[in-house]
Each structure stands twice: as C-alpha cells, then as structure tokens.
C-alpha cells in the first residue's frame, strides 16, 4: 500500500510541525491505525499512534505530542513541543486493521527541521 | 572542476547560516573567485562573491550579507539577515582566475531554510 | 535477555484439543503483537495468527480459521494457542514468535518450538 | 492470498562463494518483505525487513534488495556459518505466507 509524505517540513518557532500523510487503499477499511516513527542513528522510536474509524476523528491520547485530522485516505498530522534536538526523519505508517485483509504501508520519511528560538531579552 | 557543498543548512534563529564550499583544484592557482547563487523558482540570482589570493583573507564588499574564511581549497561562507523568504537552494560557484588555464566549478546547491522567530512579547 | 518459550505440546488425536503457551521475558510484552508460526516435519515455515499488542485485532491463516484462537493474557506476558478440531495436518512444530514494532508482520525473536503429533 | 515462491529451491556452493537467492511475489508487495535463516533443528533467525534493512547484528555479507513481486537476497562470501535453508516472508497483508525456502549446502 503507496503511502505518500512530504520530504522535507520545517517546524514552526514554536516547535510546530504539521505534514499530510497520504495512503492509496487497496480496500474498504472501515478502521485504520496511523503511527508516527521518528528515526535517528538508525534508531526507530515510536512518536504516537491513533486509530481511527473511517468518517470519524483521528484521537491520539491526551498526553500525545500528536494531533490530527483525516479526510478520505488523507491524514493531516501535527507535531507539537519540538526542540533543535527533535530534527530527524518522521515516518508515518499506515495500517488497514479491519475489515480484513490486514495491509501494511510505510512512508519514506518527513525530514522535520526544528531551529531553537532566540531567548527573548529580559524585561527590566 | 568539483565542488562540494552540503545538501542542507539551517540558519540560526537569528538568521545566520554557515556552510563550507570545497573545490578539487586542478592546478595551482593563486586567484579565486567565489560567488554564491540562489536558485528560487528557476531563477538563479547572485548573492555575493568574492575574490581572493591563495592565503589571504577573503574579502566581500561591505554592503555584502556574506562573509567568509578560505583555508586551502576550502571556503567558510555565512550569509547573514535571511528571513523565511530567503529559504532557497544556495549554490557556490568557484573560479580559478589566474594562472591560466581558466577553471570553473558549481556545486549542487545547499538547501538552506530559514523560519522567522516569534516576536518577543513587549516589554511594559 | 529477550527470550520466548513455548510449551504445551503433546501427541493428540484427531478431534482433540490443545492449547498452547509462550512465555515471553526480557522485553515489555504488551507493546509487540505476536505470531503462531509452525513447520511441519520436512516442510517450509507457515504463518498461523497474529494477536496485536493490546489484543484488540487477531488474524489467521485460512488454514486453522474457526478451529484455532489466539490470545495473550499481558498481565502473566504469556501468549495462548487455542487448537480445537485438530486433524492430522496440523502435526508440526509451533514456534511462537514476536512481531517487529515497525513492521509487525516480520518476526525478530523466535522462540526454540513446541511440538504437536496428531495421530490416532 | 499472496503467493511466494523462491528460487533456486536448493543450491550447493563453497565457502567464499557469492550466492543469490530470489524470492517472488504473486502480486505488488511493494518493500514490505522479509528474510529468514534456518538451520536444521533450530528456530528461525530474522536477517531483513523491508526489503533490504538488515536486522542489527546480521553480518554485512548479507544485503537485500527489491520491490515491488522480485526481491533478491546475496551472502556476498558464503562463510561455514551460512549453510541453513532461506525463507523470505511478506508482512504486506494477511496471510502472512513465506516462501518454500531455498536450502544452501556444501558443494
């Protein structure tokens, strides 16, 4: 299953970064899980996982540094609280749970670049 | 002649990017130029350039928003005062101008991204 | 270390039923699917179920649909085989097996096997 | 189902020999398959996933590569160690099925 992602995202000043996870579906899934991975020195961690219902919102837990949106086989997802040191790849994957057959996809990878902002001076 | 150049840069929050251009020097020059280009929307603009003796110092204008260090065949360049705007392909362009024969070599370009910082909160 | 046992298998005859079991240690149990693997004797490796993580999605091979159920109990990190109806056919060697986190179809620890005769 | 089939189904060969084994798909898995070593009376050992990543602590002799039905998988100089049966797997949707297997021996 093709699953499409931007190459490359900046994060906002604010440590906001938000990319459209794209999936053409060999199938009617009525519930699909994505999962962000990030990978760093060849390292895979998991970032956050959500299923969703099709129709229905995409929930990640509450303390999930994730959010998202999805319409159709698009899933718009942010990326919030990111630091200089969270730079790397974010894959997103893709996964048709039900009904089955079950499929697999995986993107290449958003490069997300984060700049530490500038202290602001104090105020006397 | 080769020229290397990294892929990627970021500048800093304050809007200031560094990146070292290297060139394969075929022969023994004494005289270099150094121009750095941007590529946006297939057009390609210079930004500033330089010329230089083999162990001096390199020397941009003064109105110039890059600066530099060479050190053999390699060039230091910082382009200072980007913006979000300024986010574009910058590509270094090395000349060997004297003795004769006439080099020319132009690197594949450094993506540099630039994000504006969040202005500061007023001070009262 | 990261280690799966099997056990539970046994000579059985056909009709029967047999439930296997895997113990899993030396990693969080409860953030892998898991994998029923079997080979019969001097034949290839074939995929048998899956269990995600949290048990929330199972899937079988068509082989063993309606007659086999997985199950893991995360609290005890042990993984179950449920085989009901058994027939001949199903003589093999079970490995239980632990799915990947980023594929979780492929199976980076095995464990050594358990095995299962079904024959009257 | 897909089907996966793999050839040669047997091969004999000497240490420091390169060795290829192919592996197909009866339909498009994209990269979304994996290799298996085998050795007799023992469990399985992962080798590569998603086509051509080797698991950590697989020798660099082996590699991997294709995409979407063809896939291949080389030991680039087949050491004592390397004789076993090889089973590649796809992981792109239920049922998992493997390959029959490729078994390497000594010439």
């Known amino acids: 299953m093709h699953v499409a992602q931007p190459a490359v995202v900046l994060a906002s000043s604010r440590g906001i970064a938000s990319f459209v996870c794209e999936y053409a579906s060999p199938g009617k899934a009525t519930e699909v899980r994505v999962t962000v991975l990030r990978q760093a020195d060849s390292q895979v961690t998991e970032v956050c996982a959500a299923t969703y219902m099709m129709g229905n919102e995409l929930t990640f837990l509450d303390d999930s540094i994730c959010t998202g949106t999805s319409s159709g086989n698009q899933v718009n997802l942010t990326i919030q609280g990111l630091r200089a040191m969270d730079t790397g790849l974010y894959i997103c994957k893709v996964e048709l749970m039900y009904p089955p057959p079950y499929y697999l996809g995986i993107g290449n990878g958003t490069q997300i670049y984060v700049i530490d902002p500038e202290p602001c001076p104090d105020s006397d | 002649m080769h020229v290397a150049q990294p892929a990627v840069v970021l500048a800093s929050s304050r809007g200031i990017a560094s990146f070292v251009c290297e060139y394969a020097s075929p022969g023994k020059a004494t005289e270099v130029r150094v121009t750095v280009l941007r590529q946006a929307d297939s057009q390609v603009t210079e930004v500033c350039a330089a010329t230089y003796m083999m162990g001096n110092e390199l020397t941009f204008l003064d109105d110039s928003i890059c600066t530099g260090t060479s050190s053999g065949n390699q060039v230091n360049l910082t382009i200072q005062g980007l913006r979000a705007m300024d986010t574009g392909l910058y590509i270094c362009k090395v000349e060997l101008m004297y003795p004769p024969p006439y080099y020319l070599g132009i690197g594949n370009g450094t993506q540099i991204y630039v994000i504006d910082p969040e202005p500061c909160p007023d001070s009262d | 270390q990261v280690q799966l046992v099997e056990s539970g298998g046994g000579v059985v005859q056909p009709g029967r039923s047999l439930r296997l079991s895997c113990a899993a240690s030396?990693?969080?149990?409860?953030?892998?699917?898991m994998h029923w693997v079997r080979q019969a004797p001097g034949k290839g490796l074939e995929w048998v179920a899956v269990?995600?993580?949290?048990?929330?999605?199972?899937y079988y091979a068509d082989s063993v649909k309606g007659r086999f159920t997985i199950s893991r109990d995360n609290s005890k990190n042990t993984l179950y085989l449920q085989m009901n109806s058994l027939r001949a056919e199903d003589t093999a060697v079970y490995y239980c097996?632990?799915?990947?986190?980023?594929?979780?179809?492929?199976?980076?620890?095995w464990g050594q096997g358990t095995t299962v005769t079904v024959s009257s | 189902d897909i089907q996966m089939t793999q050839s040669p189904s047997s091969l004999s060969a000497s240490v420091g020999d390169r060795v290829t084994i192919t592996c197909r798909a009866s339909?498009?898995?994209?990269?979304?398959l994996n290799w298996y070593q085998q050795k007799p009376g023992k469990a399985p050992k992962f080798l590569i996933y998603?086509?051509?990543i080797l698991q950590s602590g697989v020798p660099s002799g082996f590699s991997a590569s294709g995409s979407g039905p063809d896939f291949t998988l080389t030991i680039s100089s087949l050491q004592p160690e390397d004789f076993a049966t090889y089973y590649c797997?796809?992981?792109?949707?239920?049922?998992?099925?493997f390959g029959p297997g490729t078994k390497v021996d000594i010439k």
């Open positions: 097996a632990r799915g990947a986190v980023v594929v979780p179809a492929a199976m980076d620890v």
């Open positions: 030396g990693f969080t149990f409860s953030s892998y699917g």
């Open positions: 269990i995600w993580y949290d048990g929330s999605h199972k």
């Open positions: 339909q498009n898995i994209s990269r979304y």
């Open positions: 998603v086509a051509s």
């Open positions: 797997q796809q992981s792109y949707s239920t049922p998992f099925t």
